[in-house]
């Protein structure tokens, strides 16, 4: 994991990387498996009642760089990682929540395995 | 240069298992999947599955799920596929093929007879 | 699964003539990352296949520049703009979006 906010995403693949996909399966997906030429991310955030929902799949090389970041948006809660080492690396991952403060909001590092 | 070495044939009897290899060379064998293909004479393509190397993850053709079974070898960049059960309608020409997001190299192709 | 539909099965052409393929998919080849994964391969008599067109119009390594890729979506063509005596064979379209992989059944180019 890199942390203290570097902002370099996980190197991508020279080959298509398989991932588990839940709630954000494209239509090209098989058996809850999407492909993608950059990464397999885990995200966890709060839905409008508060609960926390944890959606999982693929992300295109193009623009993940900036969505494996972990940018703290306003008055919403989430977290996200991202991982490219194996097919369905992101069954590993595991993003928590990040603590309420205030509903105030810190840069926040970036996530990945 | 890549070279994806095959056995030229194979001759098995009904109801038996083959094992067909599959030697890699000329690049690093675990920065590619690995497919097979299947040509019945005068026919078309068909799609196995495929094994990626790295992490010995397998997808099948849903069509081929308990006929064929993809294995390799990292040590040797050898990569297998295990035909079971076999039947006059799995003699054909099998093909391995080198996968990042499409086919690039072909083995020569191992022809497979199978013959009581 | 998806269907590629080859026409015509059969071509057959004088040498120095242009010749023409279509392939059909029954559903958009589109990935979700955007890309195509469409790809055309030349099947020659007693060998495997060998890659000619990557991705809807990208020229595998020496393959010389009278091959032409076109299309999108569902749609593609495969243009030989003068025919050589070493482009006689089998043509293969070829999908890699969706699992299961397919193939087109194979536009045989020969000489009339």
């Known amino acids: 994991k890199k942390e203290d906010g570097e902002s370099t995403a996980p190197t991508p693949r020279p080959k298509v990387l398989r991932c588990k996909c839940h709630h954000h399966c494209p239509e090209d997906s098989v058996n809850n498996i999407c492909s993608t030429d950059g990464y397999c991310f885990t995200m966890i955030e709060e839905d409008d009642s508060g609960l926390p929902v944890v959606t999982s799949g693929c992300l295109g090389l193009e623009g993940s760089d900036f969505q494996c970041r972990d940018t703290p948006i306003p008055h919403q809660r989430r977290s996200i990682e991202c991982c490219t080492e194996r097919n369905e690396c992101n069954k590993d991952l595991h993003p928590t929540l990040p603590p309420l403060k205030n509903r105030d909001f810190v840069d926040g590092p970036i996530h990945h395995r | 240069q890549v070279q994806l070495l095959q056995p030229g044939a194979e001759l098995v009897k009904p109801g038996s298992s083959v094992k067909v290899s599959c030697k890699a060379s000329?690049?690093?064998?675990?920065?590619?999947?690995m497919q097979w293909v299947k040509q019945r004479p005068g026919q078309g393509l068909e799609w196995i599955g495929e094994?990626?190397?790295?992490?010995?993850?397998?997808l099948y053709n849903q069509k081929f799920k308990g006929k064929a079974t993809l294995t390799v070898d990292t040590s040797s960049s050898t990569a297998y596929m295990q035909l079971s059960s076999l039947t006059s309608e799995d003699s054909a020409v099998y093909y391995c093929?080198?996968?990042?997001?499409?086919?690039?190299?072909w083995g020569q192709g191992t022809t497979l007879t199978v013959s009581s | 699964d998806v269907v590629m539909t080859q026409t015509p099965l059969s071509l057959p052409v004088s040498l120095g003539d242009q010749a023409s393929i279509s392939c059909r998919s029954s559903?958009?080849?589109?990935?979700?990352?955007?890309?195509?994964?469409f790809h055309w391969y030349l099947q020659k008599p007693g060998q495997s296949p060998e890659l000619l067109i990557y991705?809807?119009?990208n020229r595998f390594s020496g393959v010389p520049d009278r091959f032409r890729g076109s299309g999108s979506g569902t749609d593609f063509t495969l243009k030989i703009s003068r025919v050589e005596a070493e482009d006689l064979g089998v043509y293969f379209c070829?999908?890699?979006?969706?699992?299961?992989?397919?193939f087109g059944s194979g536009t045989k180019l020969e000489i009339k």
């Open positions: 991705k809807v119009s």
């Open positions: 093929a080198r996968f990042g997001y499409y086919v690039d190299y």
């Open positions: 070829s999908q890699s979006t969706h699992v299961p992989f397919t």
């Open positions: 094994i990626d190397p790295s992490d010995t993850y397998t």
């Open positions: 000329g690049y690093t064998f675990t920065n590619y999947w």
């Open positions: 559903q958009s080849l589109v990935h979700s990352t955007g890309n195509t994964y």
